[in-house]
Each structure stands twice: as structure tokens, then as C-alpha cells.
């Protein structure tokens, strides 16, 4: 890894678990300044592997709302607009970090948690098992 | 929103910015216990809108390594294995939370940051504006 010289202006931590427990400012800085606001908004319908978005809410988590993609079909949409089972719609999944309140119901104490979310779907060639 | 009764065992915070600055335990709890480790690993090659994964490293960020998808083609792969321009490969993007060291180079002080990442690609019908 890369060794970074410590900034002398860093806050001190008296926590016995240091450096495992850290201070986090929740005023979110949004880096997505130069993006097209339309982005992926209509891809779920225009895709050959379309998906629906389901709201997953958990007040003990930050962010409390996460949208999960569920592929609409087993196959993919062909040029005629029909579902073609020569291909498969599959979810593209990503591991993301969220903050989990710990102990539960505490407003100012969290633990990092890794969760797997389905972001959208893509159309893939199926894995074909050949039989003699 | 949902009102949650405060747990009396919560740690106190003397921070003047409370509740915007919170304590976070970095011992990550992984909820992805029952997932297939292979997951989306080969979709990037099997997809009709294949993508390459590019490593984005930033030691001032947690996690420091994020993988970004870049669609390989302008069009999508058809049944003959050729790029077909009737369709377009587009990235599926997701906003994720990361921790940014603040002040810089501090090991125990972070700020939440929202970044947009491309997770994979999907094949979409183009926006057609003109009729013969």
C-alpha cells in the first residue's frame, strides 16, 4: 500500500479500539457534479434485460433506503420485443458500504457493514452444458 | 420517517457538531454470507454489452480501491458475435457512499462522500429521433 504522512492537525482519539473506531462527518460531500442527471434513469425499461426497482428500507441503516433491481424476465428481449430464452437476464451485483446503528437505535454510533445490492440487469449468453 | 426510541446504552458525544459527527466502527460486518462467490465475476465477458474493469485507487478514500466498468463497444454483441449498432451498450451507474479522510492524511477522521460508479453495462434500444 501507499504510506501517507500523518497530518499533525488530525483530531486525537482516546478510544481504546483506535484506529478501528473513527470519527465520521455525516455532511455528505457529493462528488457527482459533472454527471448527466438523466444517467441510468430510463435504462431499466430500454434494456434488453429490463428490471424493476424495489425499495428496501431499514431505519437502522444509513442510508436507510436502498433500491434493489430485480430482472423482469429469465430471458432477454429480442428485436421483435419477445422474451428470448437463448439468453439470460442476470442481475449485476455490487458490494457497497453502509453504516449500521450499533448498538441498535443509537443516533451517533455506527458500524461499517458490507451489503450486496443488485444495481441493474444485463443480458448474458447462458452457460451451456454439452451432452454427448 | 420512523421514530426509533434511543437506546440508553448509546455512547455520549461531546462533539460540538453532534449529531453530524458520529463514531464508526471500521470492523466491517459482512452480510453477504449466503452469496455465490462467483457472482457477477464472468458476466463482464458473457454479456451482450461486455465491459472492462478499471482499478480506481485513492489512499485518501475508504475503500481505497474501487473497480469501474467501461463498456467495450458502442453497440451490443449479436448472435453472430459481431457488434450490432441497432443497440447501444451503456453503463449502469450507482451512487455509493465512501469515507474520505478529512483533514487529509488523518487515519481516524473521515467525511461521508457520495460517488457515482459504473458497475457494469447493459444493452439498450437507442433513442430514435427520425422516421423515414
Amino acid at each position: 500500500g501507499i504510506t501517507i504522512p500523518r497530518n499533525p492537525g488530525c483530531p486525537n482519539s482516546e478510544d481504546k479500539n483506535f484506529p478501528r473506531t473513527v470519527m465520521v462527518n455525516l455532511n455528505i460531500h457529493n462528488r457527482n457534479t459533472n454527471t448527466n442527471p438523466k444517467r441510468s434513469s430510463d435504462y431499466y425499461n430500454r434494456s434488453t434485460s429490463p428490471w424493476n426497482l424495489h425499495r428496501n428500507e431499514d431505519p437502522e441503516r444509513y442510508p436507510s433506503v436502498i433500491w434493489e433491481a430485480k430482472c423482469r424476465h429469465l430471458g432477454c428481449i429480442n428485436a421483435d420485443g419477445n422474451v428470448d430464452y437463448h439468453m439470460n437476464s442476470v442481475p449485476i451485483q455490487q458490494e457497497i458500504l453502509v453504516l449500521r446503528r450499533e448498538p441498535p437505535h443509537c443516533p451517533n454510533s455506527f458500524r461499517l457493514e458490507k451489503i450486496l445490492v443488485s444495481v441493474g440487469c444485463t443480458c448474458v449468453t447462458p452457460i451451456v452444458h454439452h451432452v454427448a | 420517517g420512523i421514530t426509533i426510541p434511543r437506546n440508553p446504552g448509546c455512547p455520549n458525544s461531546e462533539d460540538k457538531n453532534f449529531p453530524r459527527t458520529v463514531m464508526v466502527n471500521l470492523n466491517i460486518h459482512n452480510r453477504n454470507t449466503n452469496t455465490n462467490p462467483k457472482r457477477s465475476s464472468d458476466y463482464y465477458n458473457r454479456s451482450t454489452s461486455p465491459w472492462n474493469l478499471h482499478r480506481n485507487e485513492d489512499p485518501e478514500r475508504y475503500p481505497s480501491v474501487i473497480w469501474e466498468a467501461k463498456c467495450r463497444h458502442l453497440g451490443c454483441i449479436n448472435a453472430d458475435g459481431n457488434v450490432d449498432y441497432h443497440m447501444n451498450s451503456v453503463p449502469i451507474q450507482q451512487e455509493i457512499l465512501v469515507l474520505r479522510r478529512e483533514p487529509p492524511h488523518c487515519p481516524n477522521s473521515f467525511r461521508l462522500e457520495k460517488i457515482l460508479v459504473s458497475v457494469g453495462c447493459t444493452c439498450v434500444t437507442p433513442i430514435v429521433h427520425h422516421v423515414a
Epitope: 448527466n36 | 458502442l74 451503456v90 430514435v128 422516421v131
Partner: antibody
Framework: EVQLVESGGGLVQPGGSLRLSCAAS????????MSWVRQAPGKGLEWVST????????DYADSVKGRFTISADTSKNTAYLQMNSLRAEDTAVYYC???????????KYYPWFDYWGQ | DIQMTQSPSSLSASVGDRVTITCRAS??????LAWYQQKPGKAPKLLIY???SRASGVPSRFSGSGSGTDFTLTISSLQPEDFATYYC?????????FGQGTKVEIK
């Protein structure tokens, strides 16, 4: 009204670099593929590169691969062509062109160069 | 790469003449062909796409036909503003390729 305005051309020594810009207006920039097509003095048209701003996906002619880089800034509605390691044979008029998807009876819909810069 | 060969390279014609330009692809390109008109010092202009569909604002005297490897651009009655160079272009596969051009001159 659709407009494509190129800039950035000039005289450069072999091995030098140049960056061309194509400012687009009058249409939804991310919905179209944008290309660069060149024409050497007294010669025909040669496709150079294409980008789809919505995806960032790109394609290049073999003659420029590894030397030229096409990019797009969707906030500025501008496509760019960064040309490095320039050679005498790169001397040409470079046109920026939009590829619009058109319906036709024969092949449903497909992209064609419908507007060109001047 | 798919080679596009136009013939003739140049032709002389008079106003009112019927003019035919042909374009041959080195392999089948179905109907993935366009025709462009270019006047000196100007950018090309789309005339025909999908081998036979006329682009918006293009006069009806311009027509396109063909599929597979052989294509034709026809100007039914040549007008003074039609004197220019015409290019065919295939969009069947990358790289996109153009014909070498046909120059239509005044006789």
C-alpha cells in the same frame, strides 16, 4: 437548430500534439454518437473515431489507435479529439459529425452521419 | 475491413440528365449503406440512408437502391446545384468505410 462547431486546429510539427473540440448545440448530446471524420487535401473521407457520450464507449480507426483519444464532456456538450504523435499523413480537414438513429423500411433503425461541423 | 468501390470516379453531365453512380462493397453489407453529397470547401451532407431512404429535406430526384454488395445512387434530372462529389459509406461493421468518391462535373 443543430450546430457543431469545431476548433483547435493548427500547424504542428511531426511528433507534436493537438486537441480538437466540437461544441454541440440544438440537440440532446448524450442521445447521439459523435464521430470525427477527416479528409486529406484532395482526397476522400476517412472515419477516425466515435464516442457514445451516454456510455463513454469509444472506437478508433487502426491508423490512429494508440495515438488519438476521443472524449466527451456531457456538462459542456462538447466532444474532443486529443491527437498525439502526429504524422505528416494526419494532415487533413477534421470534421465532427453526429450520428443520428433513423428508421428505414429495410433495416429498422440505424445510425448515420446526419449533421457535420463546418 | 470492408472496401467500398465507386464508379465512375468522375463523370460529366448536363442539366436535366439522368445520372447513375454505383458503389460496390467487398462483402455483403445488407442495406447498411448511406450516400453523401459534398461541395468544394463544405462538409458532406446526408442524402440517402439504409440504401434507399431519403434524408429529411433531400429532393425526390435523388434515389437509392440495392442491397448486399451492389448499390446505386440515381439523380433523375440533374440540377445546377447537384454538381458535387458523392460518397457512399458502409455502416455494417467497424471500421466505417467510405467509397473514394464520384465527382459530377458540368459537361
Amino acid at each position: 437548430e443543430v450546430q457543431l462547431v469545431e476548433s483547435g486546429g493548427g500547424l504542428v510539427q511531426p511528433g507534436g500534439s493537438l486537441r480538437l473540440s466540437c461544441a454541440a448545440s440544438g440537440f440532446s448530446f448524450t442521445s447521439y454518437m459523435m464521430s470525427w471524420v477527416r479528409q486529406a487535401p484532395g482526397k476522400g473521407l476517412e472515419w477516425v473515431s466515435t464516442i457514445y457520450p451516454e456510455s463513454g464507449a469509444t472506437d478508433y480507426a487502426d491508423s490512429v489507435k494508440g495515438r488519438f483519444t476521443i472524449s466527451a464532456d456531457t456538462s459542456k456538450n462538447t466532444a474532443y479529439l486529443q491527437m498525439n504523435s502526429l504524422r505528416a499523413e494526419d494532415t487533413a480537414v477534421y470534421y465532427c459529425a453526429r450520428e443520428g438513429y433513423y428508421y428505414s423500411t429495410s433495416i429498422k433503425y440505424y445510425p448515420w452521419f446526419d449533421y457535420w461541423g463546418q | 475491413d470492408i472496401q467500398m468501390t465507386q464508379s465512375p470516379s468522375s463523370l460529366s453531365a448536363s442539366v436535366g440528365d439522368r445520372v447513375t453512380i454505383t458503389c460496390r462493397a467487398s462483402q455483403s453489407i445488407s442495406s447498411y449503406l448511406a450516400w453523401y453529397q459534398q461541395k468544394p470547401g463544405k462538409a458532406p451532407k446526408l442524402l440517402i440512408y439504409g440504401a434507399s431512404s431519403r434524408a429529411s429535406g433531400v429532393p425526390s430526384r435523388f434515389s437509392g437502391s440495392g442491397s448486399g454488395t451492389d448499390f446505386t445512387l440515381t439523380i433523375s434530372s440533374l440540377q445546377p446545384e447537384d454538381f458535387a462529389t458523392y460518397y457512399c459509406q458502409q455502416r455494417y461493421s467497424q471500421p466505417i468505410t467510405f467509397g473514394q468518391g464520384t465527382k459530377v462535373e458540368i459537361k
